[in-house]
Interface confidence: low
């Protein structure tokens, strides 16, 4: 009489999650007497997953008719696959006795489970900086088996190199993590780009998964200032303007001051977007030239975005002033002018 | 312990056709017994394999619904479905070294199938 | 879908000389692979199992080697009985049972 055999015939089997395992499992022979086990692991410490004569096993069933006469098939199917269901998987044969006493067990089926990243997030700087510094982008996802997963940056279509990635644990595990930090290096014309994050897997078949970032989050583009006198007209006032240029974001405060005492205060708002994103924005002043006896100082004060003030400071001449003055008064710059 | 298959003729496209495979010397069913097939001139492709102590096969992905294979005590058969031009071939049973662990240690001499108008 | 890729397609060498032919598979097999030859009009003949253990009967002039993806064959101090078509074969189970395409070994 040839030796009995428990033949698991699939050394492994991978299985998408959500989805239902068939682990094959059949023996050469009836004799002897005695029940079939499936185990998870080997050893002591091995797992119990289905015993026919006692237990719940509410997730797995038997694929043919166990109390079947004759049945030497034993392979069982496990509904609703988790991650946490990896592993190796062992039928093991019983010879009947009290207690029953382990005969012969299967070579084993490795069962891993194709789980699908979650989509990547990207979270950008907490703070904004200007051009010509770099921000970090980071992206991340989780959830997802096998370990073998493809995470590419672009920024406006085009791959990103400063890149680190690191896949979490590096030992084997049921599921994995993704995270990677992009450095870009941002540029005044960066309102309107944007970060891409695209992870692939084996469970996307082929469609990758993306994350984004809007460089507008991460970018702070200071104002140029130029302050102009226009022609003075017949009644005796100037008009002086504070043409600011090229910001972002809108978030800004201009003050007037005529020789450093407060005239005016304003406050950006519903601007006109430029076709690179950036604002601009213009502020008159009308100075009297007949009420001072002295050259007037008018200063442009400009706060952006939480920065330090920049100044750009202008002399209306009035110790002649005849009808028709023209735009050649002197302007001074007495603050730093952010490029 | 050998193996001979039979059945191998010609046939015209879409007639049914059942190849057989007879083992001596070891029961089927302590071992599989797989399928393998090689067109004229070219390389061997596995078909399928049915399993010892029960009635589990496996096909490889292209002749799913194309092949059916079967067993008694004693023979194992190959069913061609509907056969095309494309199944003009050679075709060999193998015994599996031991049942789960399918190289092929015997071989029978192969039977020439032959699908033609 | 998993393959297995064999290189060269032939090989020509003479009688006392030495062949090598490569067997690479698109994903892990660990070391379920098997090398057979076969000459013309025959079945194949059972050379290697588990990639490198010789099969019954076999000239250790004959070594596998290799495990996970890449199994190289040698052919070693070559007789003109060696000339045959020589086929790798993957049985990582049912999904993976495919044999390579072969490489033909011409004998000078």
């Known amino acids: 009489e040839e030796e009995l055999q428990v033949i698991q015939p699939e050394k492994s089997v991978s299985v998408a999650a959500g989805d239902s395992a068939t682990l094959n499992c059949t023996v050469s022979s009836l004799i002897p007497v005695g029940p079939i086990q499936w185990f998870r692991g080997a050893g002591p410490g091995r797992e119990l997953i289905y015993n026919l004569k006692e237990g719940h096993f509410p997730r797995v069933t038997p694929v043919s008719d166990p109390t079947k006469r004759n049945n030497m098939d034993f392979s069982i199917r496990i509904s609703n696959i988790t991650p946490a269901d990896a592993g190796t998987y062992y039928c093991v044969k019983f010879r009947k006795g009290s207690p029953d006493v382990e005969l012969k067990s299967g070579a084993g089926t490795e069962l891993s489970v194709r789980a699908k990243p979650s989509a990547p997030v990207v979270s950008g700087p907490a703070v904004r900086a200007t051009a010509e510094h770099t921000v970090s982008f980071t992206c991340e996802s989780h959830g997802f088996s096998p370990r073998d997963i493809t995470l590419k940056w672009f920024k406006n279509g085009n791959e990103l190199s400063d890149v680190q990635t690191n896949v979490d644990p590096a030992g084997k595990s049921v599921s994995y993590s993704i995270r990677s930090t992009a450095r870009v290096v941002l540029t005044r014309r960066d309102v309107h780009s944007q970060v891409i994050c695209e992870v692939a897997h084996v469970t996307l078949q082929g469609d990758p998964l993306r994350g984004t970032a809007n460089l507008s989050e991460a970018i702070r583009v200071p104002p140029f200032l130029e302050v102009t006198q226009q022609s003075m007209r017949a009644d005796n006032q100037v008009n002086v303007t504070c043409q600011v240029t090229k910001f972002y974001p809108q978030r800004l405060q201009l003050t007037w001051l005529e020789n450093g005492n407060v005239s005016r205060t304003e406050m950006a708002s519903a601007l006109p977007e430029n076709k690179d994103g950036t604002y601009n924005w213009t502020s008159w002043l009308l100075v009297n030239v007949s009420a001072h006896r002295d050259d007037v100082k008018l200063t442009c004060q400009v706060e952006h975005d939480g920065q330090p003030a920049v100044n750009k400071s202008f002399s209306v001449k009035v110790s002649a002033h005849p009808k028709e003055q023209g735009s050649n008064t002197a302007a001074e710059n007495t603050g730093t002018n952010e490029r | 312990q050998s193996m001979e298959e039979s059945g191998g003729r010609l046939v015209t496209p879409g007639t049914p056709l059942t190849l057989t495979c007879t083992a001596s010397g070891f029961s089927l069913s302590n071992y599989g017994v797989s399928w393998v097939r090689q067109a004229p001139g070219k390389g061997l492709e596995w078909i399928g394999i049915i399993y010892g102590g029960s009635d589990i096969t496996a096909y490889a992905s292209w002749a799913k619904g194309r092949f059916t294979i079967s067993k008694t005590s004693t023979t194992v058969d190959l069913t061609i479905t509907s056969p095309t031009t494309e199944d003009t071939a050679t075709y060999f049973c193998?015994?599996?070294?031991?049942?789960?662990?399918?190289?092929?240690?015997?071989w029978g001499p192969g039977t020439l199938v032959t699908v033609s108008l | 879908a998993f393959d297995l890729t064999q290189t060269p397609s032939s090989v020509e060498a003479p009688v006392g000389g030495t062949v090598i032919i490569k067997c690479q598979a698109s994903?892990?097999?660990?070391?379920?692979l098997a090398w057979y030859q076969q000459k013309p009009g025959q079945p194949p003949k059972l050379l290697i199992y588990?990639?490198?253990t010789l099969a019954s009967g076999v000239s250790s002039r004959f070594k596998g080697s290799g495990s996970e993806t890449q199994f190289p064959l040698t052919i070693s101090d070559l007789e003109s009985a060696d000339a045959a078509t020589y086929y790798c074969q993957s049985y990582y189970g049912s999904r993976s049972n495919v044999f390579g395409g072969g490489t033909e070994v011409v004998v000078k």
């Open positions: 193998a015994k599996s070294y031991t049942n789960g662990m399918d190289y092929y240690n015997i």
């Open positions: 994903q892990s097999i660990s070391s379920y």
């Open positions: 588990s990639a490198s």
